[in-house]
Interface confidence: low
Amino acid sequence: AWELTILHTNDVHSRLEQTSEDSSKCVNASRCMGGVARLFTKVQQIRRAEPNVLLLDAGDQYQGTIWFTVYKGAEVAHFMNALRYDAMALGNHEFDNGVEGLIEPLLKEAKFPILSANIKAKGPLASQISGLYLPYKVLPVGDEVVGIVGYTSKETPFLSNPGTNLVFEDEITALQPEVDKLKTLNVNKIIALGHSGFEMDKLIAQKVRGVDVVVGGHSNTFLYTGNPPSKEVPAGKYPFIVTSDDGRKVPVVQAYAFGKYLGYLKIEFDERGNVISSHGNPILLNSSIPEDPSIKADINKWRIKLDNYSTQELGKTIVYLDGSSQSCRFRECNMGNLICDAMINNNLRHTDEMFWNHVSMCILNGGGIRSPIDERNNGTITWENLAAVLPFGGTFDLVQLKGSTLKKAFEHSVHRYGQSTGEFLQVGGIHVVYDLSRKPGDRVVKLDVLCTKCRVPSYDPLKMDEVYKVILPNFLANGGDGFQMIKDELLRHDSGDQDINVVSTYISKMKVIYPAVEGRIKFSTGSH
């Protein structure tokens, strides 16, 4: 028997420095977790103690904090090289800055293979990107070889900016021939490493013949055997065992997100490459694990540029940006409109001639807007200003909801109106009329939404049974501020870009902004 230790991360999302327990900015260092300096300590400890170790990443290193905003992927290459990752799969967020934003800072700089079998380049890009990412890689580990085959969510064109010269194929269809190729090369230990979410990970384990282990990402799935060590609730045991169509037991793993845990899986193979046993658990990277001093020193050096960045001008406003709770928790506020407009703008993807865009709607809890921005400071808007408006370090995500769920959400928005509570919704691509003289649960008297399947966007009444795409904060997607109906009834959820980054990019693009209060949210009395 031959034993392999797989160490894995996924959806790190730019958390190079240690973070708080909820993966936001570290405040009380004695309680902080994760970060590459702490990860390196643990990885080195395991590498010294165990003979056959692979360190793998299942994608979405990009996007999530000011580190990515400033360094644009160079930080990912630098610190992943420093940690000596063995392989990485491409995630959807690796395309956030377009193909160029992937090629230059990461693909050309990484000293480890970057993989995806289901992304095919065409046209002029094919020669430019050739060899910079691979469908699979055979890695020598001790006296053996292990094949790693990569995959990426086929939804990436809707979630990021891969351009028109990359085709995202069905994962299972694309993986099978690559695995077969590995088999012909006498590679009998094969890991599928990819970024399509836990449901697809399980399907790959079930359907792709010859895959021994699946290491996934995208869905931020936390798996754990026994008592979990922090706040995350396990979606199942670690590893999650799937019985394949040809009768094999295939371990599937994922390690939550944000570098909070290091996935730790021990696999025992027989001489024919069959998995005999698999066990392990994610390791919580808490403050009991010291940060490696050399990596920490490097982090501190890279930080200097970040501190400068946060005070630089992104753009100007010529109007007061009203982000006060007195406005945003009671009525339409222009800060809410600005943020929602930025959220929609960030999700412009012309992927189908029938649609002007795949999504037109935004909702945003008023309680998530934490500060106004005064235009009388020469109109200057900085990252620091935006960090006061959006201090939670969240993301703006894409969900699919039925019209009936949206209706419930808007009823919840005003169910206790007048108490300055955070659930009052700011909107984009939506016109809502409330009648507060009616009883809670029956206060939405008009709800019109902007069409997507149209050449000239216009507002149509919400249809209860139709499925709509909506951009919203991850806080709402997770049921925050009492929006349990969103969490319970959403049909799909893909995590998006860092909130501040979305707004800062929009302001930089627009250069001068002047958002207005324009009748997106109205109040009426009596019959409508």
Partner: antibody, heavy 122, light 111 residues
């Protein structure tokens, strides 16, 4: 609803130890820090330390490092504080409290037990 | 450790008037858009009760006559209009860094 139940009183002799309990209900015990606070009669509040039940991770006020030991039993959702080498200075009401901080790291103490009155007397 | 200085130590306010309690920290307790300062009310024989968290956020179920403000090192708790049942001792507490200390308390008496 969230509740933290503490025994009303403990009478202990000088030099002895006491282990007081704090039984939590109405929320996920392993997901929130439990803080312990001391209040001497007619005096203010002193932060002793806290414990994260999910991992057993603890933080102590330097002043109480050798005096207090914080533990938890997750199976019964109970937090414990043991005070050792008791003197009259340790006579006080000891509160356990649940820290908030699910969506932000505010760590405000949103629910409190009724307190245990510890009297050190021979 | 961060020292929190509360003033006044006690005050007497007429029914319906405004009570203002101040809390000064020896070090900045604000960062990343948050002020890590909280206010509690304690009545004799009872445990403290959270009123305000993160400087200005009203805890659920607390009457709106209580409000908090401030950032950096200076924070204020306001009660207006004061009611009979507000007679109590009020404490500020920070959670910016360990250990999380409390202020010495302000006793409010209703005239």
């Amino acid at each position: 609803q969230v509740q933290l139940q503490q025994p009303g009183a403990e009478l202990v002799k000088p030099g002895a130890s006491v282990k007081m309990s704090c039984k939590a209900s109405g929320y996920t015990f392993t997901s929130y820090w439990i803080t312990w606070v001391k209040q001497r009669p007619g005096q203010g509040l002193e932060w002793i330390g806290d414990i994260y039940p999910g991992s057993g991770n603890t933080n102590y006020n330097e002043k109480f490092k050798t005096k207090a030991t914080l533990t938890v039993d997750t199976s019964s959702s109970t937090a414990y504080m043991q005070l050792s080498s008791l003197t009259s200075e340790d006579s006080a009401v000891y509160y356990c409290a649940k820290e908030g901080g699910l969506t932000t790291e505010d760590y405000a103490l949103d629910y409190w037990g009724q307190g245990t009155l510890v009297t050190v007397s021979s | 450790d961060i020292v929190l200085t509360q003033s006044p130590a006690s005050l007497a306010v007429s029914l319906g008037q405004r009570a203002t309690i101040s809390c000064r920290a020896s070090k900045n307790v604000s960062t990343s858009g948050y002020s890590y300062m909280h206010w509690y009310q304690q009545k004799p024989g009872q445990p403290p009760k959270l009123l305000i968290y993160l400087a200005s956020n009203l805890e659920s179920g607390v009457p709106t006559r209580f409000s908090g403000s401030g950032s950096g090192t200076d924070f204020t708790l306001n009660i207006h209009p004061v009611e009979e049942e507000d007679a109590a001792t009020y404490y500020c507490q920070h959670s910016r860094e360990l250990p999380f200390t409390f202020g010495s308390g302000t006793k409010l008496e209703i005239k």
